[in-house]
């Protein structure tokens, strides 16, 4: 009996937003199976994702455990058991993926504006802490807690009636702009970390404009 | 060629308990899967339960909750603890080990009778 056609894995792919972190490779499996083991550059490698068609790997409850840390996966190859096939010995085909330092590079998923409110010609928008996967003593840290001061939100508005933009910043959730009294205005936020090199802001939030449900009005 | 012997086989009566073990005749790689699959009279080969370096397992679920396997890489040895066993599991069972290739053993007889 002859040697089985296994092949490696390619095109490993780190696919993450707000630290949810799924690995991605090709091909779809013929007569193979695929296990994932990940690892960080000091520590054991791990097997997830064991025995598996897929060709998706959800490493999350690994990364999460230190977003920090640089991790290294790699896709392992294997014959399925239904193939009959003996060759002489050898290690398993296996391709790594590249290098992931979740802190420094998952995406950051589309802000959402939780609300605004108008005091005479001050609005307060806040913006959303939207809760990662990342665990602290057994409670989910949000985005902020994470990030800390290193996370920014830049907020795009302007007078529904014209299209000229104007833009805040804020290094918490929350801008207290002035505005037209008199005036509707129409909100975005993006969420941005100015200290990377890659994947620095997330996608505009939704659009949210006063004179809709999100926002409250108050005349002084 | 990596060798691998069976042993544990033999007769046992429903609700019985049997254990095989398979020694591989040379040093098998952590990176290597190792693992159990059977054959029953007049059918193909099926999996049963395999077992990664670091003890992650996956089962077939006509045998989960019953079986167990185990592995002691110092000593190049896959275990399966069959408790439970029922009629339909007579088969003869085959250790195997994968790396870039299936390595099988020569199969040991399992019969579940009273």
């Known amino acids: 009996s002859g040697t089985t056609n296994t092949v490696a894995a390619y095109n490993l792919t780190w696919k993450s937003t707000n630290f949810k972190t799924i690995l991605e490779w090709e091909p779809k499996p013929v007569n193979q199976v695929y296990t994932v083991q990940i690892s960080t550059k000091s520590g054991d490698w791990k097997s997830k994702c064991f025995y598996t068609t897929d060709t998706e790997c959800d490493l999350t409850d690994e990364i999460v455990k230190d977003v920090k840390q640089t991790y290294l996966a790699r896709v392992f190859s294997y014959p399925a058991g239904n193939v009959e096939s003996t060759g002489s010995a050898g290690e398993p085909l296996y391709e790594n993926s590249p290098e992931f330092t979740p802190y420094l590079e998952t995406n950051l998923g589309q802000p959402t504006i939780q609300s605004f409110e108008q005091v005479g010609t001050k609005v307060n928008v806040t913006v959303e802490d939207e809760r990662t996967l990342v665990r602290r003593n057994n409670t989910f840290l949000s985005l902020r807690d994470v990030f800390g001061k290193d996370l920014i939100y830049t907020l795009y508005y302007w007078k529904s009636s014209s299209s000229g933009k104007k833009t805040a910043k804020t290094n918490t959730n929350e801008f207290l702009i002035d505005v037209d009294k008199g005036e509707n205005y129409c909100f975005s936020v993006q969420a941005v970390i100015p200290s990377r090199t890659v994947n620095r802001k997330s996608t505009d939030s939704p659009v949210e404009c006063m004179g809709q449900e999100k926002g409250e009005f108050r005349e002084i | 060629q990596v060798q691998l012997v069976e042993s544990g086989g033999g007769l046992v009566k429903p609700g019985g308990s049997l254990r095989l073990s398979c020694t591989a005749s040379?040093?098998?790689?952590?990176?290597?899967?190792m693992g159990w699959h059977r054959q029953a009279p007049g059918k193909g080969r099926e999996l049963v339960a395999v077992?990664?370096?670091?003890?992650?397992?996956h089962y077939a679920d006509f045998v989960k909750g019953r079986f167990t396997i185990s592995r002691d890489n110092a000593k190049n040895t896959v275990y399966l603890q069959m408790n439970f066993l029922r009629a339909e599991d007579t088969a003869v069972y085959y250790c195997?080990?994968?790396?870039?290739?299936?390595?099988w053993g020569q199969g040991t007889m399992v019969t579940v009778s009273s």
């Open positions: 077992i990664s370096g670091d003890g992650v397992t």
């Open positions: 040379e040093t098998i790689s952590s990176t290597y899967i």
């Open positions: 195997y080990a994968a790396g870039r290739w299936n390595h």
